[in-house]
Interface confidence: low
């Protein structure tokens, strides 16, 4: 029987009455156009909703927008359009919400063609009040807040100027011209690329990378011949043109660009690309595109300096056309990532790693599912997950996989069970152990969200017809109740809950359509009365993460340590609460070969924990370039996985010797460079 329909499912008592008392409808006095919603701050309950409507006239398009504010998680909204002088707000810039709980909001207004500059509306009190500010430039991008100081903003102008404000957008200063891309780094540092000869496009590969650590008072040129740059974790990456041809190489810095080393990654040609898939302070996942329009490439994982890389996964799906990849960080369990590979027969298969890219496997077949028509063997197949690529291909997949750090072990995703991803209508699957095992949770495509740190899962069927029913589960998707939230069905457009999955409120957005008009409408449902009591100690149970063999002393060891979590029992119907903190107990493991990646020049054959020398490098000295000096690597093929905390046990020898010989990448010996200060 389908999940939720067997006899064992305990009903939540009187839930209809409890939810009916906590369902709040708001009809927006708007013609349907587009709607965007932003949460302002954390646990503040403040939501801003911007609706825009374009009326196409014969010669021009007339736009109208309205701004609404809620301070009770969406139960009630107030029209605050007058606070922004009834100005039309440009939706392509969105609402720029400040970091942390700064309460800052910037809205960018549409201005008439001949104006000297743009116009913004600024609020620093969670959108209670706004100040209108006319800009000395026309913005090209949304205002970007410094992560360290929300008073510091940067923006690019339509004329490629880099503008900075030190007083939250009150006063602006152009600190540099001819800027292509700008990003905040740490310590209020700004990194940006500049062109010399005409345009960003024309100078691609001949850009200069600049840094200012004092908001534009002075600059340092930290790289030339730049194609692009990126920041990830504590790493700064630049892809740099080679001197003699049109290839590019990645260079990496861990000190904000003062010193650079060439990453031991393949160079790429004009049609290829690099992509940082994920990065933290320990390491980086880097995708390197294959030559030709193959739609795939190779994932490499870095050492702790971002310099030496190990091949992690071949034939990794990453389309050049739409730039789509299914690479997903499973945030509910440490070390887990899911992605797709393009197999030799051009079918797409899902792979999962539990040890930060050390080894990849297929997803285990859900026990309550049958293999579909893609399976050659009806008894042996895997679960394949639909993510960004499927969504881009317009498959019937309304949502990407979902996981939350505070809902430990829970992963929800659309998928199909077979030898590869199927184009048939997918079902929704859930894992409660970070991706090791899976269960079919809901039949057919759904929108879903996690509330109360996993205490409640909410879902709405994906349908082209109007809907009026929401489903919810209090036991991690085993059993489902349905609740009719309105008599009159609405055309559903989205589910909204406060980021962080701590809230117990869910907002259902949609529009009503009648003969004369259509209007935006939202229903906010508060589940607090379903989870009547606060969870107590007895409601939690100890769970060992990454456990695959309880008999093994090293069971659960991943990246050198194991973690025991206190997790809510599925049978407990109670509130984790907004202040819930994940309780975990780590313990260090002995080192095994699993705690080491294969070093530069080595690889790990499939289903083998030993690293063997790459045939093409056998007998060659392993030398690589570090900070412009040639280094000699003495290794027996292993290096500790970044972030691995194991102690004792296996200890492969690894030594790096400075050969005292100069080696330069072209990055450190470019042809020309300018440097200047304000």
């Amino acid at each position: 029987s389908a999940p939720g329909e067997d006899e064992e499912c305990g009903r939540v008592r009187d839930f209809v009455a409890k939810l009916a008392n906590n369902t709040h409808q708001h009809v927006f006095d708007d013609l349907r156009g587009s709607v965007s919603l932003s949460w302002v701050g954390d646990s503040t309950g403040v939501i801003l909703v911007l609706t825009t409507f374009h009326v196409p006239l014969v010669i021009m398009t007339f736009g109208q927008s309205k701004l609404y504010r809620s301070e009770d998680y969406g139960k009630n909204f107030k029209d605050i359009t007058d606070l922004i002088n009834n100005t039309f707000i440009r939706t392509e810039f969105g609402m720029a919400i400040g970091p942390e709980n700064s309460g800052k909001v910037v809205l960018t207004a549409e201005v008439s063609g001949g104006s000297r500059g743009g116009r913004i509306f600024r609020s620093s009190d969670f959108a209670k009040n706004f100040v209108q500010t006319d800009l000395p430039f026309h913005p090209l991008t949304q205002m970007m807040y410094s992560p360290q100081n929300s008073d510091y903003l940067l923006a690019l102008s339509t004329e490629n100027g880099l503008w900075v404000s030190k007083n939250f957008g009150g006063k602006w200063e152009e600190i540099h011209k001819a800027v292509c891309l700008a990003k905040w780094g740490s310590d209020n540092t700004i990194f940006f690329t500049t062109y010399a000869n005409g345009s960003c496009k024309a100078d691609l590969g001949a850009l200069e990378l600049w840094r200012t650590s004092d908001l534009g008072k002075s600059f340092k040129t930290i790289g030339v011949k730049i194609y692009s740059f990126g920041l990830g974790g504590r790493f700064l990456f630049a892809s740099v043109m080679a001197d003699k041809d049109t290839t590019r190489r990645i260079h990496v810095s861990t000190d904000q660009g003062d010193t650079w080393s060439m990453a031991q990654l393949p160079s790429v040609g004009q049609e290829q690309f690099y992509s940082i898939l994920a990065a933290n302070d320990d390491m980086v996942f880097m995708h390197v595109d294959e030559p030709g329009d193959t739609g795939f490439g190779t994932i490499f994982t870095s050492d702790d300096r971002g310099i030496v890389y190990s091949k992690s996964l071949d034939r990794h799906l990453y389309t050049t056309t739409g730039g789509e990849t299914d690479f997903t960080n499973v945030t509910s369990l440490r070390g887990v990532y899911i992605t797709s590979v393009l197999s030799e027969d051009n079918s797409i298969q899902t792979m999962i790693t539990f040890d930060q890219g050390g080894r990849w496997t297929h997803l285990r077949k859900p026990e309550n599912s049958e293999c579909d028509a893609t399976a050659k063997n009806k008894n042996e197949c895997s679960l394949h997950i639909h993510a960004s690529y499927s969504i881009s291909q317009k498959l019937n997949v309304p949502m990407a996989p979902l996981s939350e750090p505070n809902a430990v072990g829970i992963v929800i995703a659309h998928g199909s069970v077979g030898d590869a991803i199927s184009v048939m209508v997918p079902d929704v699957y859930i894992s409660d152990d970070g991706g090791y095992s899976w269960t079919k949770m809901l039949e057919g495509p759904h929108y879903y969200t996690i509330l109360d740190s996993g205490g409640i899962i909410v879902a709405i069927e994906h349908s082209s017809r109007p809907i009026n029913v929401i489903k919810f589960s209090t036991d991690e998707g085993q059993c489902w109740q349905t609740y009719t939230f309105t008599r009159d069905p609405i055309y559903f457009t989205g589910l909204a809950s406060e980021p962080g999955a701590r809230s117990m409120n869910i907002s259902i957005w949609g529009f009503t359509e009648s003969f004369l008009t259509s209007q935006w409408v939202s229903y906010t449902i508060d589940f607090k009365d379903i989870l009547e009591r606060n969870c107590e100690e007895k409601d939690y149970t100890i769970w060992l993460a990454h456990s695959t063999d309880p008999e093994d002393y090293e069971d659960g060891c991943i990246l050198g340590y194991k973690e025991q979590f206190l997790r809510l029992r599925k049978s407990s119907v109670c509130q984790n609460g907004r202040d819930y903190v994940v309780t975990k107990q780590p313990s260090i493991c002995l080192c095994s070969l699993e705690d080491f990646l294969c070093d530069f020049g080595y690889y790990r054959p499939e289903n083998d924990s030993k690293c063997v020398e790459q045939p093409e490098l056998k007998g060659h000295d392993l030398e690589f370039c570090l900070y412009g000096r040639e280094e000699h690597l003495t290794t027996n093929g292993y290096r500790k996985i970044p972030g691995d905390k194991c102690q004792g046990g296996v200890n492969p020898v690894r030594e790096v010797k400075d050969l005292k010989k100069k080696c330069t990448s072209n990055f450190l010996s470019p042809e020309k460079q300018n440097s200047k200060s304000n």
Epitope: S213, D214, K217, S218, F219, Q256, T259, Y627, Q673, N674
Partner: antibody, heavy 117, light 108 residues
């Protein structure tokens, strides 16, 4: 007006330790990198250490690594240099300097460190 | 490490003279060079940054030029207060950000 005032210098025996301080005023301290530079009697300038604006990144010449530690307290607008295992050749006037990127634009008046038995 | 060679190490000149001090670097530093002036018993003062930019409050008779590995500080018309020691310093790439050994400018 930008001001940098060093203190903490003095006479110390070889092998001893000393902590220099630099009090900054007249500018927004927490957005600037800061450096220490020294000058032995009758000799040229020698770069000693640099610290980034938030204190995340520190730099030293190889010969001083391990003995000298640069740090800062942005709440107090102060820069420090902890010097351990001092040698006679560390005798110098030590300057603190504001270091915005491509230059050291303001310097303190210096504090004399004498290492002698 | 990048080596800085400043020349001359000392120089005698008269008030009104045009004076040039050069700094040669062991590798291309892409204009990441500063010049400082130091008078006896005083702390150094920034004159030029990024090879060619004059610091605030510095008289216009001082100018910086150069690129690649060769850089020059020029004083167009020497004044009595210009007699001092001058240092160059690079800020390219890898620390250490070395100073030149200095040029002592004396009255003839």
């Amino acid at each position: 007006e930008v001001q940098l005032v060093e203190s903490g210098g003095g006479l110390v025996q070889p092998g001893g330790s000393l902590r220099l301080s630099c009090a900054a005023s007249g500018f927004t301290f927490n957005i600037y990198g800061m450096s220490w530079v020294r000058q032995a009697p009758g000799k040229g300038l020698e770069w000693v250490a640099t610290i980034s604006s938030g204190g995340i990144y520190t730099y030293y010449p190889d010969i001083l690594k391990g003995r000298f530690t640069i740090s800062r307290d942005n709440a107090k607008n102060s820069l420090y240099l902890q010097m351990n295992s001092l040698r006679a050749e560390d005798t110098a006037v030590y300057y603190c300097a504001r270091h915005p990127g491509g230059a050291m634009d303001y310097w303190g008046q210096g504090t004399l460190v004498t290492v002698s038995s | 490490d990048i080596q800085m060679t400043q020349s001359p190490s000392s120089l005698s000149a008269s008030v009104g003279d045009r004076v040039t001090i050069t700094c040669r670097v062991s590798e291309n530093i892409y204009s990441n060079l500063a010049w400082y002036q130091q008078k006896p018993g005083k702390s150094p003062k920034l004159l030029v940054y990024a090879a060619t930019n004059i610091a605030d409050g510095v008289p216009s008779r001082f100018s910086g030029s150069g690129s690649g590995t060769d850089y020059t500080l020029t004083i167009s018309s020497l004044q009595p207060e210009d007699f001092a020691t001058y240092y160059c310093q690079h800020f390219w790439g890898t620390p250490p950000w070395t100073f030149g050994q200095g040029t002592k400018l004396e009255i003839k």
